[in-house]
Interface confidence: medium
């Protein structure tokens, strides 16, 4: 595929990545799939500067990010190392709370109203942010 050198229409460029901010809500898996269909992934936050940039756009609204522990350990969807990477959890989070009565614990991470992170039930219909890196090979076939 060809390298992406500029962001798609309605995406915002920042530090060699492109971001798309939803205005509706989906379950985490549906949001994850939406981003993948756009040749992107749910946002992966690697620094305080990126955290601030994303929060600037989403405001004080619960919003999914590309971080989950559905298979055990916490993992970023793009393979970024969780243990050594940037974190911005709320105090006492993540807590894998079972008291919500929806079955199971809490396996998906989201931005809360103050920007810090919380784990929650993955089926909740929150807004989401997609991210794709510039200069990566896109999956589109080359023009003939």
């Amino acid at each position: 595929g060809s390298e992406r050198t500029c962001c798609p229409v309605n995406w915002v460029e920042h530090e060699r990545s492109c971001y798309w901010f939803s205005r509706s809500g989906k379950a985490w898996a549906d949001a994850d799939n939406y981003c993948r269909l756009e040749d992107a992934h749910l946002v992966v936050v690697t620094s305080w500067e990126e955290q601030k940039f994303v929060q600037h756009h989403i405001g004080p609204v619960n919003t999914w990010m590309g971080l989950h522990d559905q298979n055990g350990p916490w993992k970023w969807v793009d393979g970024t190392d969780y243990e050594t990477g940037f974190k911005n959890w709320r105090p006492e989070q993540p807590d894998d709370w079972y008291g919500h009565g929806l079955g199971g614990g809490e396996d998906c991470a989201h931005f809360t109203d103050d920007g810090r992170w919380n784990d929650d039930v993955c089926q909740r219909p929150y807004r989401w942010v997609c991210e794709t890196e510039l200069d990566k090979a896109s999956q589109e076939p080359p023009l003939l």
Partner: antibody, heavy 119, light 110 residues
């Protein structure tokens, strides 16, 4: 040290378009990570955010002014510009340009330029 | 349109302590609003004092501090100096990359 300097006509006639330019020195607009902003202050009043632009060209405007505002960037000149159309006397104000860093907020400001709308 | 509200005016004695607040019509101000505070003296451009609730710029005097207080952003001046007499503005960030300034507080040092 980043410095910003506004320039443009100090007098604009009603119904015309106000045009201002902000020249940035001490740092490159195209280095990324910053929003280049316009703010105004009516005489004796508070500050009003007009809008800003990212170096890639993405713009964000105050909803109350959106229909009349255009902000553009010229990275080759390290400048960004404001155009405000169909001005009236109510647009008479000191216009400031400023840099907004997602990490450090509105940290650097120009000294401001007074624009009077009068025939 | 979001409205950001500040006390129109406050008076403090030299050496005293005063707290200015900043409220949002959308509800409680949180750290996710990344409150900024600015000082403006007559005939001058605003000067940034505080960013992201409580962080000081390198030029911000130690007597200025920012915090969240009862659902509002707050700027506290401790050991007020005569040169602190000025207008003070807060700024809040909102979703969609929008920002809004407060109406300003005129601080008089008597």
């Amino acid at each position: 040290q980043v410095q910003l300097q506004e320039s443009g006509p100090g007098l604009v006639k009603p119904s015309q378009t106000l045009s201002l330019t902000c020249t940035v020195s001490g740092g490159s607009i195209s280095s990324g990570g910053y929003y280049w902003s316009w703010i105004r202050q009516h005489p004796g009043k508070g500050l009003e955010w007009i809008g800003y632009i990212y170096y890639s060209g993405s713009t964000y405007y105050n909803p109350s002014l959106k229909s009349r505002v255009t902000i553009s960037v010229d990275t080759s000149k390290n400048q960004f510009s404001l155009k405000l159309s169909s001005v009236t006397a109510a647009d008479t104000a000191v216009y400031y340009c400023a840099r907004d860093s997602p990490l450090r907020g509105f940290d650097y400001w120009g000294q401001g330029t007074l624009v009077t709308v009068s025939s | 349109q979001t409205v950001v509200t500040q006390e129109p005016s406050l008076t403090v004695s030299p050496g005293g302590t005063v707290t200015l607040t900043c409220a949002s019509s959308t509800g409680a101000v949180t750290s996710g609003s990344y409150p900024n505070w600015f000082q403006q003296k007559p005939g001058q451009a605003p000067r940034a004092l505080i960013y992201s609730t409580s962080n000081k710029h390198s030029w911000t005097p130690a007597r200025f501090s920012g915090s969240l207080l009862g659902g509002k952003a707050a700027l506290t001046l401790s050991g007020v100096q005569p040169e602190d007499e000025a207008d003070y503005y807060c700024l809040l960030y909102y979703g969609g990359a929008q920002v809004a300034f407060g109406g300003g507080t005129k601080l008089t040092v008597l």
